[in-house]
């Protein structure tokens, strides 16, 4: 008795959602009393399928509502875990084990990835010295590098940091702040990159015509 | 505490029916597999059959099929294997065992044996 | 029905030193291998599920390996209370078997 895994590692967006494949031979009709599927994350249960029905007691209450096996693919012999609203929490590697007049299992890697889409701006000018600070702040994870350029796309060195945001989630909170002596309608720009993926996402800052005073918490879009 | 007791020995002649019982303390009968395996003096482990005392379900070793029944009952956690038409060679240690995860076919918990002795 | 075989049937080993034991099985069983430790007059102890997973409670020097026909039963370093007889198992298909067993003997 032998169970595939078509894909050991699955690489999802956070807030998606992941389908995650182990197959068993089915000869003729199933016979779902017969069968007996677990998958696990780590030593939580997070389906636990025994004679013909899900057990739900056992399953660990960070995937209550949210995991699921089909048993239209179960009868074609396709132990299927969906997981929606993927959680940052939910990386990691998940077990499928199966027990059909035998048994086997394998090991699924689940990554998970949340863009640093939408990415927060301000602006703001110390009138003593006519410096700008431009300031970049997204949600997202793993950590991602802030790269400043100018309209010429030269670089520019800016002071990044990063906190781990104090939502459930535990988004990792990137604030990059950069001190530049500009003029009225100058073009900067700050690009958050994921070294590993190398996935980015970048905002435009335009330096306003008036002068803005110094205002930590007034936030343009 | 999990906990497997089974009946005590039996003396039994050649021909004749044993049924031995495994009462279950410690944990939920139902959730878990129980199966029975043997040992004859001095030799390895042999793998008789199992149930499922949820459902009733059983999986025999064929070797045994027509010899061997495997029963539950629910109302006092307790299984229980009777083979029959004894032999000689039927003479061993019987024991009872939990599976460690239902289905999953690795026995965590052990009764602490019933010696069965076939002579004339 | 799968064959498990183990060798050695009889494995003398000097207290403290490691101690190996092989189990052929014959056909690919993926990890569906258990490993028990009995002593005499005992019932059988769980050792080893998933050809390398320790039961809970088993100590560290306690590992196993192997997928597909061959498997491998290691004691980093033998403990007087190491000595009994060590039987696999496969749970891949039925019958589930076992193997004849390897006695761990003081040398």
């Known amino acids: 008795f032998t169970i595939t895994a078509p894909k050991d590692l699955y690489v999802v967006e956070y807030g998606s959602n992941v389908t995650m494949e182990c197959r068993f031979p089915v000869e003729q009709k199933l016979d779902l009393l017969a069968l007996v599927v677990y998958w696990e994350k780590e030593d939580k249960e997070v389906i636990q399928f025994v004679e013909g029905e899900e057990d739900l007691k056992p399953q660990h209450s960070s995937f209550r509502g949210r995991a699921f096996l089909p048993k239209d693919q179960l009868l074609k012999g396709n132990a299927v875990l969906q997981i929606t609203d993927v959680k940052l929490q939910d990386a990691g590697v998940y077990c499928c084990m199966i027990s059909y007049g035998g048994a086997d299992y394998k090991r699924i890697t689940l990554k998970v990835n949340a863009p640093y889409r939408k990415i927060n701006q301000r602006i703001s000018m110390d009138p003593a010295t006519s410096e700008h600070e431009l300031m970049c702040q997204a949600e997202g994870y793993p950590e991602a590098e802030v790269i400043w350029t100018n309209s010429d796309h030269q670089s520019l060195s800016g002071e990044t940091t990063v906190t781990t945001s104090q939502t459930e989630e535990k988004l990792l909170n990137v604030t990059s702040v950069l001190r530049v002596n500009a003029t009225a309608n100058d073009v900067f720009h700050c690009t958050f990159w994921r070294v590993h993926s190398g996935e980015n996402h970048t905002a435009e800052l335009i330096i306003p015509e008036l002068p803005v005073p110094r205002l930590p918490h007034n936030r343009t879009h | 505490e999990v906990q497997l007791v089974q009946s005590g020995a039996e003396v039994k002649k050649p021909g004749a029916t044993v049924k031995i019982s495994c009462k279950v303390s410690g944990y939920t009968f139902t959730s878990y597999w129980m199966y029975w395996v043997r040992q004859a003096t001095g030799q390895g482990l042999e793998w008789m059959g199992r149930?499922?005392?949820?459902?009733?379900?059983?999986k025999y070793n064929e070797k045994f099929k027509n010899r061997v029944t495997i029963t539950a009952d629910k109302s006092t956690s307790t299984a229980y294997m009777e083979l029959s038409s004894l032999r000689s060679e039927d003479t061993a240690v019987y024991y009872c065992a939990r599976d460690y995860r239902k289905g999953l076919y690795a026995m965590d918990y052990w009764g602490q044996g019933t010696t069965v002795t076939v002579s004339s | 029905d799968v064959v498990m075989t183990q060798s050695p049937l009889s494995l003398p080993v000097t207290l403290g030193q490691p101690a190996s034991i092989s189990c052929k099985a014959s056909?690919?069983?993926?990890?569906?291998v258990a490993w028990y430790q009995q002593k005499p007059g005992q019932a059988p102890r769980l050792l080893i599920y998933?050809?390398?997973t320790r039961h809970t409670g088993v100590p560290s020097r306690f590992s196993g390996s192997g997928s597909g026909t061959e498997f491998t039963l290691t004691i980093s370093s033998l403990q007087p209370d190491d000595f009994a007889t060590y039987y696999c198992?496969?749970?891949?298909?039925?019958?589930?078997?076992f193997g004849q067993g390897t006695k761990v003997e003081i040398k």
């Open positions: 149930i499922d005392p949820n459902s009733g379900s059983t």
């Open positions: 056909q690919d069983v993926g990890t569906a």
């Open positions: 198992q496969q749970y891949n298909s039925y019958p589930l078997t």
């Open positions: 998933w050809a390398s």
